[in-house]
Amino acid sequence: TLNSVLNSNAIKNLPPPLGGAAGHPGSAVSAAPGILYPGGNKYQTIDNYQPYPCAEDEECGTDEYCASPTRGGDAGVQICLACRKRRKRCMRHAMCCPGNYCKNGICVSSDQNHFRGEIEETITESFGNDHSTLDGYSRRTTLSSKMYHTKGQEGSVCLRSSDCASGLCCARHFWSKICKPVLKEGQVCTKHRRKGSHGLEIFQRCYCGEGLSCRIQKDHHQASNSSRLHTCQRH
């Protein structure tokens, strides 16, 4: 029942043991020996799907939003619900599926062809409306296959970093994602507070390269919090 889901924070449904699974190709970390890998799939399937209780959209998956499961239901009981497809009703961007955003109460396509002219207008709307936040854009970045061009090169549209060539990562650019260079030592990087931090970041930088982490530049330690410069530095 939903109540038992909401009242429990314990880890459940641990998989039974199974002899050594193979590592993931191209991964520098090991697979888990003694762990069952359902269907051999690294990512979650939604068989026996149990709703996840939430307080905000950021707690849900990238194709979900947080809301009461019933119309006019108890506002205190919220779960992650499947995103809404194009032309469905919405109250905020996070309700719309990847590649869409909420405009005038309807999920509409955010593909580059007709979206660019509405960027400025949408930002204005978002600041003036409690129900319309840019948080949705930070997560709704999946693009339809028709928008792909040369795979993997810098500037190519992507879904995830594995779509990009070596030395590149998949990062937001407006409300699509493109392959950008992984940051090198000394380059400026972005350090977020983890929770809900990506909302206004429409030009996202890549992460720092191997052996580097994003830290405050030493000569900026005395600067105010808002002006601290972070750069990629050796561990």
Epitope: N13, P15, I35, P38, Y43, Q44, I46, E56, R194, Y207
Partner: nanobody
Framework: EVQLVESGGGLVQPGGSLRLSCAAS????????MGWFRQAPGKERELVAA????????HYADSVKGRFTISADNSKNTAYLQMNSLKPEDTAVYYC?????????????????????WGQGTLVTVSS
Amino acid sequence: EVQLVESGGGLVQPGGSLRLSCAASGFNFDDYAMGWFRQAPGKERELVAAISWSLSRTHYADSVKGRFTISADNSKNTAYLQMNSLKPEDTAVYYCAAAPRPKRVSVSYFSTASNYDWGQGTLVTVSS
């Protein structure tokens, strides 16, 4: 490419404390859940604790509730497991793990081992 390096394991007496660290690199830390698993000799690997990508949710195995605390420091791309009131039965190899934010998340997502990439592990021995 996901890289996870654990540290902080060692020998500790029953009732003592340890803090494990997991240095992560090669991925956007903000977009991953971090977990700690453990595997005792002759036993299956079990998830001890996990923290969500939003940092707002933590999940614990019943056996460690009230004793262990998972946390993450985004400024250092590091996850931690603070272990207090350690017992001999906590003796195991502890593995750091990272799971990407999925399209859809369910109650069982954090406890499903196949969602995670893994570090090499650090040994924790609780003995007098």
